[in-house]
């Protein structure tokens, strides 16, 4: 059993490594956004036993603006972007209580712009453990309709070792 | 068509530092969320960390505070710097560029490199 895509959450990106069952995963404030004090990042598969479908737990997190870096012009794309500060540790307690967080999640002094470029062909290299899947692109509509500001891309099988509407990590596409 | 070539391994001493480059050619690399992974012989890979494209980044708790990761994105390039190197550093390093479901949610791809090699020895 595992989960579907965890949701979209304003202003934070996450980078899921495991779609199993309790897998924790992190989500983090964009650069110039911080997390808010008393709000949660984390987010945990689990099973719901009465439908015994696998969903992810929803975060708290609020992303606001660091007012440390309003007054800060965003840097042209040409620079170089990094971050040094991680975020503050976090606990996925039954009780629900998290420790506050006042620093960011990434003390990102520049913010890179990219246009994204829809309907481009990507075309796998071999992977280090699997090796070759070939896949396509395409944009998807997962998201809610205030999120569909950006155009996403989304994993397809396509002759390959791995059946239609399985994506990496065991994440299978059922709902 | 995407396609990612790692550099910058090598032998290094304990406490050293590298910095490992990840090319990206092909529609899409500049707005990708890309991660470093490593992998050694016999054993699982392991995630690194993450830049997505904000600039903001995320890492593994062994490597918080060592690893650093920029882009730059002019030269379609991802960067792993690499500092206070440890002999269980040792790996090959690869970088991936994810594939995004949602909104701001992203995971590991079919898009590899070929990977560099980290050795850290005395």
């Known amino acids: 059993i595992t989960c579907p895509p965890p949701m979209s959450v304003e202003h934070a990106d996450i980078w899921v490594k495991s779609y199993s069952l309790y897998s924790r995963e992190r989500y983090i404030c964009n650069s110039g956004f911080k997390r808010k004090a008393g709000t949660s990042s984390l987010t945990e598969c689990v099973l719901n036993k009465a439908t015994n479908v696998a969903h992810w737990t929803t975060p708290s997190l609020k992303c606001i603006r660091d007012p440390a870096l309003v007054h800060q012009r965003p840097a042209p794309p040409s620079t170089v972007t990094t971050a040094g500060v991680t975020p503050q540790p976090e606990s996925l307690s039954p009780s629900g209580k998290e420790p506050a967080a006042s620093s960011p999640s990434s003390n990102n002094t520049a913010a890179t712009t990219a246009a994204i470029v829809p309907g481009s062909q990507l075309m796998p290299s071999k992977s280090p453990s699997t090796g070759t899947t070939e896949i396509s692109s395409h944009e998807s509509s997962h998201g809610t309709p205030s999120q569909t500001t950006a155009k996403n891309w989304e994993l397809t099988a396509s002759a390959s070792h791995q059946p239609p509407g399985v994506y990496p990590q065991g994440h299978s596409d059922t709902t | 068509e995407v396609q990612l070539v790692e550099s910058g391994g090598g032998l290094v001493q304990p406490g050293g530092s590298l910095r490992l480059s990840c090319v990206g050619s092909?529609?899409?690399?500049?707005?990708?969320?890309v991660a470093w992974y490593r992998q050694t012989p016999g054993k699982q890979r392991e995630w690194v960390g993450v830049?997505?494209?904000?600039?903001?980044?995320d890492y593994a708790d062994s490597v918080k505070g060592r690893f650093t990761i920029s882009r730059d994105n002019a030269k379609n390039t991802v960067y792993l710097q690499m500092n206070s190197l440890k002999p269980e550093d040792t790996a090959v390093y690869y970088c991936?560029?994810?594939?995004?479901?949602?909104?701001?949610?992203?995971?590991?791809?079919?898009?590899w490199g070929q990977g560099t090699q980290v050795t850290v020895s005395s």
């Open positions: 991936n560029a994810g594939v995004t479901t949602n909104r701001g949610v992203h995971h590991e791809s079919n898009y």
């Open positions: 092909g529609d899409g690399f500049s707005i990708s969320a």
């Open positions: 830049i997505f494209s904000s600039g903001s980044t």
